[in-house]
């Protein structure tokens, strides 16, 4: 598996891909040490109480969605907002908290992941090395007959996070997008200073997992603004 390679969102690419020791799940891997692409990999930090700018839902945590903070507000300014609980109004599935989906404008329980079971077409392409089985990739489309699919595994190229298996998100790696692990507690995460800054990252990290948020590590409060380390922490 690509376990160690794409751990902490991969920030180390495949060298010891299979069974290699490039860090372990709990490790806080730094961002691609030594990568020298101009403008690339600039992980900027902000105070954790400021809103988190976003362009799409995938950039927010699992308990957040991306939208304009004011009703009918400027569509160009979007931030990550807290997800809507059951029986709250919604316009799309991502607005509802995990375990719920948007039905007729209201967040309802997704009993057995109802909406995620939409008909999906599988498009599988092989890539990676001979020993790797992580070459599945699926794209969501609506079909008239029921089909089952294999979601993209770690390292699979993806279009959006819904293409990736559970526990993975779709994030940039070099100049493409691949499925990477959602961050666990204690792992280094990225806070963006302004909307669009994520576009400068050659290696984009996933968001923090459910129940976690990206905050300044407590023992780093004294550090200078530019070197503050953010990690995934319990709410």
């Amino acid at each position: 598996t690509l376990n160690s390679v794409l751990n902490s969102n991969a920030i180390k690419n495949l060298p010891p891909p299979l069974g290699g020791a490039a860090g372990h799940p709990g490790s806080a891997v730094s961002a691609a040490p030594g990568i020298l692409y101009p403008g690339g990999n600039k992980y900027q930090t902000i105070d954790n109480y400021q809103p988190y700018p976003c362009a799409e839902d995938e950039e927010c945590g699992t308990d957040e969605y991306c939208a304009s903070p004011t009703r009918g507000g400027d569509a160009g300014v979007q931030i990550c907002l807290a997800c809507r609980k059951r029986r709250k109004r919604c316009m799309r599935h991502a607005m509802c908290c995990p375990g719920n989906y948007c039905k007729n404008g209201i967040c309802v329980s997704s009993d057995q992941n109802h909406f995620r079971g939409e008909i999906e077409e599988t498009i599988t392409e092989s890539f990676g090395n001979d020993h790797s089985t992580l070459d599945g990739y699926s794209r969501r489309t609506t079909l008239s007959s029921k089909m089952y699919h294999t979601k993209g595994q770690e390292g699979s190229v993806c279009l959006r996070s819904s293409d990736c298996a559970s526990g993975l998100c779709c994030a940039r790696h070099f100049w493409s997008k691949i499925c990477k692990p959602v961050l666990k507690e204690g792992q280094v995460c990225t806070k963006h200073r302004r909307k669009g800054s994520h576009g400068l990252e050659i290696f984009q990290r996933c968001y923090c997992g459910e129940g976690l948020s990206c905050r300044i590590q407590k023992d780093h409060h004294q550090a200078s603004n530019s070197s503050r380390l953010h990690t995934c922490q319990r709410h």
Partner: antibody
Framework: QVQLVESGGGVVQPGRSLRLSCAAS????????MHWVRQAPGKGLEWVAV????????YYADSVKGRFTFSRDNSKNTLYLQMNSLRAEDTAVYYC????????????WGQGTLVTVSS | EIVLTQSPGTLSLSPGERATLSCRAS???????LAWYQQKPGQAPRLLIY???SRATGIPDRFSGSGSGTDFTLTISRLEPEDFAVYYC?????????FGQGTRLEIK
């Protein structure tokens, strides 16, 4: 199956322009970073430029910076390389190549299109 | 930029023999971001190895990559007639991406 087909090559005078195209099929084009690599006759490979999956990010080799522009149209699954102020040393076979995804190495290449800059 | 120097320039061997191709970088290649390609006359290059040691899809296991830092090696354990070609190394750990000048593997 994955296919990359370049077109637009030909003979052009120094200082003139040319636009190469690369039509992609058989894969989810809008998820992949794409590159141009060239090879002068009888010589080795030279990386020319890269464009990110969404076209927001581009980098160029110093030898072509300011003269070449790389763009993509994800709705048409097509890449473009606009080459201006061409020089004799730009004479080469130009390949478009797909990035592997998990590595910035190139797993699929087109057949190449020859650009000859000569007076 | 990182300059990659391949040696030897030409390697003459017979089918069945072991081939060892070297690629040396002018500075350390970040995270072993190094790839190897094979190119035959009139054809586009073919990816063999990425990440210094990971075989690309469909590549026979007689091809293996090793090395780290500044010294990398492509080994073909037992040469087949179709292996005679030009081999290039490529680094993608820093901008610009660069290729070595190539090693020609010819039949003795």
């Amino acid at each position: 199956q994955v296919q990359l087909v370049e077109s637009g090559g030909g003979v052009v005078q120094p200082g003139r322009s040319l636009r190469l195209s690369c039509a992609a099929s058989g894969f989810t084009f809008s998820s992949y970073g794409m590159h141009w690599v060239r090879q002068a006759p009888g010589k080795g490979l030279e990386w020319v430029a890269v464009i990110s999956y969404d076209g927001s990010d581009k980098y160029y080799a110093d030898s072509v910076k300011g003269r070449f522009t790389f763009s993509r149209d994800n709705s048409k699954n097509t890449l473009y390389l606009q080459m201006n102020s061409l020089r004799a040393e730009d004479t080469a076979v130009y390949y478009c190549a797909r990035e592997l995804g998990i590595a910035a190495s190139f797993d699929y290449w087109g057949q190449g299109t020859l650009v000859t800059v000569s007076s | 930029e990182i300059v990659l120097t391949q040696s030897p320039g030409t390697l003459s061997l017979s089918p069945g023999e072991r081939a060892t191709l070297s690629c040396r970088a002018s500075q350390s290649v970040s995270s072993n971001y190094l790839a190897w390609y094979q190119q035959k006359p009139g054809q586009a290059p073919r990816l063999l190895i990425y990440g210094a040691s990971s075989r690309a899809t469909g590549i026979p296991d007689r091809f293996s990559g090793s090395g780290s830092g500044t010294d990398f090696t492509l080994t073909i354990s037992r040469l087949e007639p179709e292996d005679f070609a030009v081999y290039y190394c490529q680094q993608y750990g820093s901008s610009p991406i660069t290729f070595g000048q190539g090693t020609r593997l010819e039949i003795k």
